[in-house]
């Protein structure tokens, strides 16, 4: 039977080393056996490269393409093949489709004056364009109360957040996770970091009396 693409490839770049494209076929497909995504930088002398896709779901394929440190002018020609049959052709400009890397190593430390210090690592090296462009969203939620959650936007440079213990329920277990985006690149949000959990042992002032 003929092979058809249901949802054409959607691609994002981490703007440092990898671009990922995902698409959906019209029926369950063994992506790695049946399909190939070729990509070539639109630059004089560049070579054609081939990405072997993997299955994300029965009919969803994903391809991770190693790219050089991206620059704004880079444009890739993409061609999706099923054997000799060209299923889809398009172009992709990494700088226009940025999905930042996930922030790492989220930790929570008790700090002075009944505050918690949340720290994480910027996923980009200092020399990368995105290092100084990231802002973050931190989600803090009560593990036992789905309605008790807070969202903090960290728009300053440092990957830290100070949290007053008094803003959280005493004795409750909380989890935090963080994600990043790059405003100047009009990026999408990164994936959420793994959660880190801690016990908020702050004692309210009234109980102290």
């Amino acid at each position: 039977g003929s092979v058809k693409v249901l949802h054409e490839p959607s691609c994002f770049s981490d703007y440092i080393s990898t671009s990922v494209c995902q698409w959906k076929m019209d029926h369950p497909t063994n992506c790695s056996a049946e399909l190939r995504l070729s990509y070539q930088l639109d630059f004089m002398g560049s070579e054609n490269h081939t990405c072997v896709p993997e299955n994300r779901e029965d009919s969803v394929c994903v391809c991770s393409m190693p790219i050089d440190d991206a620059v704004e002018a880079d444009v890739y020609q993409l061609d999706l093949w099923a054997g000799q049959q060209l299923l889809w052709s398009g172009s992709f400009q990494p700088s226009k489709h940025v999905k930042p890397r996930t922030p790492g190593n989220l930790t929570v430390h008790p700090n002075i004056s009944h505050t918690w210090l949340l720290m994480w690592t910027n996923p980009y090296p200092t020399e990368n364009h995105l290092h100084s462009e990231l802002t973050y969203m931190v989600n803090v939620s009560n593990d036992n109360d789905p309605e008790d959650f807070k969202v903090y936007n960290v728009t300053y440079m440092g990957p830290t957040l100070r949290l007053a213990a008094s803003t959280l329920k005493s004795g409750a277990s909380y989890s935090a996770r963080v994600r990043a985006w790059a405003q100047t690149y009009n990026s999408t949000w990164s994936d959420w970091s793994p959660s880190t959990t801690w016990l908020n042992y702050y004692e309210p002032w009234e109980q102290h009396l």
Partner: antibody, heavy 125, light 112 residues
């Protein structure tokens, strides 16, 4: 030591054909794009054609498009220029040169960093 | 096509002086920060061309530091300090950004 040795230049009549060769040594030939550049007597340099490392992508100057074909044999470390429908204005010394490194996603550029000694093509009746 | 224009077309300099050659392109040769696809070549009398400068300012292997390239976008300069008799020849700029690759007309440097 990098060496490029061109051959195949000759006196040929207008409308005739010629095949130039350039044998390379001293570097990993398949990793680099190669170019042909020509120089008419007493004139400046004129780029003719470029081929990437795999041979999968070729580029031509408008003056030779449709008449000249650049190719390479990476097993023999040899670059070729097939010249058909030759005209008097194709008379020149033809140089081959090593160009950008194309095995990376974005070619690494060093300019035309090594040149051959040139081979003379004369088109005259 | 990108047009490359060199000035002057000829230059006469005394040994030990500095020679400057200008090259202007009809379109920007800046692909990304620090990457101007502009080269300088020297063709000595009776010889093949040789690379001097690539990416606007990077010296090719074995080229003395008397040769320096500068500029960005559309305006570039080759400077040869402490000129020697051996520097005589024709200097060409060339854009390596897009097909067709194009050379300047050449600047003939004569040593007095």
């Amino acid at each position: 030591e990098v060496q490029l040795v061109e051959s195949g230049g000759d006196l040929v009549k207008p409308g005739g054909s010629l095949r130039l060769s350039c044998v390379a040594s001293g570097f990993t030939f398949r990793d680099y794009a190669m170019t042909w550049v020509r120089q008419a007597p007493g004139k400046g340099l004129q780029w003719v054609s470029l081929i990437n490392g795999s041979g999968g992508k070729t580029y031509y100057a408008d003056a030779v498009k449709g008449r000249f074909t650049i190719s390479r044999d990476n097993a023999k470390n040899t670059l070729y220029l097939q010249m058909n429908s030759l005209r008097a204005e194709d008379t020149a010394v033809y140089y081959c040169a090593v160009d950008r490194l194309t095995k990376t996603i974005r070619p690494q550029y060093y300019g035309m960093w090594s040149w051959g000694q040139g081979t003379l093509v004369t088109v005259s009746s | 096509d990108i047009v490359m224009t060199q000035t002057p077309l000829s230059l006469s300099v005394s040994p030990g002086e500095t020679a400057s050659i200008s090259c202007r392109s009809s379109q920007s040769l800046l692909y990304s920060i620090g990457y101007n696809y502009l080269d300088w070549y020297l063709q000595k009398p009776g010889q093949s061309p040789q690379g001097l400068i690539y990416l606007g300012s990077k010296r090719a292997s074995g080229v003395p530091d008397r040769f320096s390239g500068s500029g960005s976008g559309t305006d570039f300069t080759l400077r040869i300090s402490r000129v020697e008799a051996n520097d005589t020849g024709v200097y060409y700029c060339m854009q390596g950004l897009q097909s067709p690759l194009t050379f300047g007309q050449g600047t003939k440097l004569e040593i007095k």
